[in-house]
């Protein structure tokens, strides 16, 4: 991996072992604008392959709301408006990291966490098994 | 909001003013398996709207190593194989958290941060803009 | 309660069109497709057709070129219509509706309405 | 067409027994998002079909645990731990993955 030379203005951390704990400073920098992803865009409506946008809360997690995609269709929507089995919408999914409260309740210690979201639907061939 | 009782167990925090400082545990938990997206499925071959994963690596930023999607057509792919341009491809984008190093070159100090990634593409209807 | 309830005309004419109407309480056809299908006496059941609840549709390709759905959110009606019927069309007709949870089932019927193709 | 076959036609039991009603696809029933969308249905003399599983092993609201699915690919089965009188019908396996959506041709528990 790459070397960088430590920052002489770094805290100090006593704790130089796994489990590593770090200072993370909560107020965010933000370089985008839009954070809602129905307003982002409407491709979930456009798409060959449709999804919806189902909120999933839980306070014990930053962020709280995250939003999940679920492919409206096992098909894809053809160019007469049907649902076209010939093709497949499947979720694109993405791992991200979150911060899990830990100890539970606690609002200043976190333990990061990766999870795995869909973000959107796409079309795809499917792949076809035959029975010998 | 939710207001959830704090428990007692909680680690003390003396900066009760934003920006918040949190203790964060990088002992990560994973829900998932597998990480490689290249591995986790082949979406990105067999969509309609093919893309490229490219590596984006900035050794300052955790995760490190964050894999961008970008749309190979303008157009879809047809059932003849052809790229249509009467629909595009478009990226599906989510924002997500990451942490950065701050002070720069810190090996125990961050600051979280909100970037906007393209996780794959998908194949929308255009809007047509018709000239008066 | 979810309640589906299927009205057709119960004789047909050989070559004639059949039209049945599927009404529905209990849910919005803006949440959840309806399907159709069909059980001639003492067989089996086919599926026939479904419309989406986002009005897209997806037909059995054996029957497509006599098939048509349609929906009124508003009244909370489907309708089927099926064009120049033969006697094997003779069947029981239910709606059914599909689930809301990305099952793709079946999850509550119409008790069937009787068609009877006869001249 | 996928066709799903449901031999026997007919499985006689006697009450208190197990049964187990198999399915078998001439195609793949796993989508390209990895979920296997095969259920089943029971349809008692006289009334419209009941969903009693969906997507291969999970059990709709209502239905006693007594029912189970299991299976994967293109090989299903139905089991009821100990029959009840209430069970007795034509039993359809189906499958929502590839379209036209078909049944099977039913098998119909009866008692022994």
């Known amino acids: 991996g790459i070397t960088i030379p430590r920052n002489p203005g770094c805290p100090n951390s006593e704790d130089k072992n796994f489990p590593r704990t770090v200072m993370v400073n909560l107020n965010i920098h933000n370089r985008n604008t839009n954070t809602n992803p129905k307003r982002s865009s409407d491709y979930y409506n456009r798409s060959t392959s449709p999804w919806n946008l189902h909120r999933n809360e839980d306070p014990e997690r930053y962020p709280s709301v995250i939003w999940e995609a679920k492919c409206r269709h096992l098909g894809c929507i053809n160019a007469d408006g049907n649902v076209d089995y010939h093709m497949n919408s499947v979720p694109i999914q993405q791992e991200i990291l979150v911060l899990r409260r830990e100890p539970p309740h606690c609002p200043n210690s976190f333990r990061l966490e990766k999870i795995l979201v869909s973000v959107g639907c796409t079309c795809v061939t499917p792949i076809v098994h035959h029975v010998a | 909001g939710i207001t959830i009782p704090r428990n007692p167990g909680c680690p003390n925090s003396e900066d009760k003013n934003f920006p918040r400082t949190v203790m964060v545990n990088l002992n990560i938990h994973n829900r998932n398996t597998n990480t490689n997206p290249k591995r986790s499925s082949d979406y990105y071959n067999r969509s309609t709207s093919p893309w490229n994963l490219h590596r984006n690596e900035d050794p300052e930023r955790y995760p490190s190593v964050i894999w961008e999607a970008k749309c190979r057509h303008l157009g879809c792919i047809n059932a003849d194989g052809n790229v249509d341009y009467h629909m595009n491809s478009v990226p599906i984008q989510q924002e997500i958290l990451v942490l950065r190093r701050e002070p720069p070159h810190c090996p125990n100090s961050f600051r979280l941060e909100k970037i906007l990634v393209s996780v794959g593409c998908t194949c929308v209807t255009p809007i047509v803009h018709h000239v008066a | 309660e979810v309640k589906l309830k299927e009205s057709g005309p119960g004789l047909v004419a050989p070559s004639q069109s059949l039209s049945i109407t599927c009404t529905v309480s209990?849910?919005?056809?803006?949440?959840?497709?309806v399907h159709w299908v069909r059980q001639p006496p003492g067989k089996g059941l086919e599926w026939l057709v479904v419309?989406?609840?986002?009005?897209?549709?997806t037909y059995n390709s054996a029957l497509k070129s006599r098939l048509s759905i349609s929906k009124d959110n508003s009244k909370s009606q489907v309708f089927l219509k099926m064009n120049s019927l033969q006697t094997d069309d003779t069947a029981m007709y239910y709606c059914?509706?599909?689930?809301?949870?990305?099952?793709?089932?079946?999850?509550?019927w119409g008790q069937g309405t009787s068609v009877t193709v006869s001249s | 067409d996928i066709e799903l076959t449901q031999p026997p036609l007919s499985l006689p039991v006697s009450l208190g027994d197990q049964a187990s009603i198999s399915c078998r696809s001439s195609?793949?029933?796993?989508?390209?998002?990895?979920?296997?969308?095969l259920h089943w249905y029971l349809q008692k003399p006289g009334q419209s079909p009941k969903l009693l599983i969906y997507?291969?092993?999970n059990r709709f609201s209502g239905v006693p645990d007594r029912f189970s699915g299991s299976g994967s690919g293109t090989d299903f089965t139905l089991k009821i731990s100990r029959v009840e009188a209430e069970d007795l019908g034509v039993y359809f396996c189906?499958?929502?993955?590839?379209?036209?959506?078909?049944f099977g041709s039913g098998t119909k528990l009866e008692i022994k």
């Open positions: 059914a509706r599909n689930d809301g949870s990305y099952y793709y089932a079946m999850d509550y």
């Open positions: 419309i989406w609840s986002d009005g897209f549709t």
């Open positions: 195609q793949s029933l796993v989508h390209s998002n990895g979920n296997t969308y």
């Open positions: 997507k291969v092993s």
């Open positions: 209990g849910f919005s056809l803006t949440s959840y497709g």
């Open positions: 189906s499958q929502s993955t590839h379209v036209p959506f078909t």
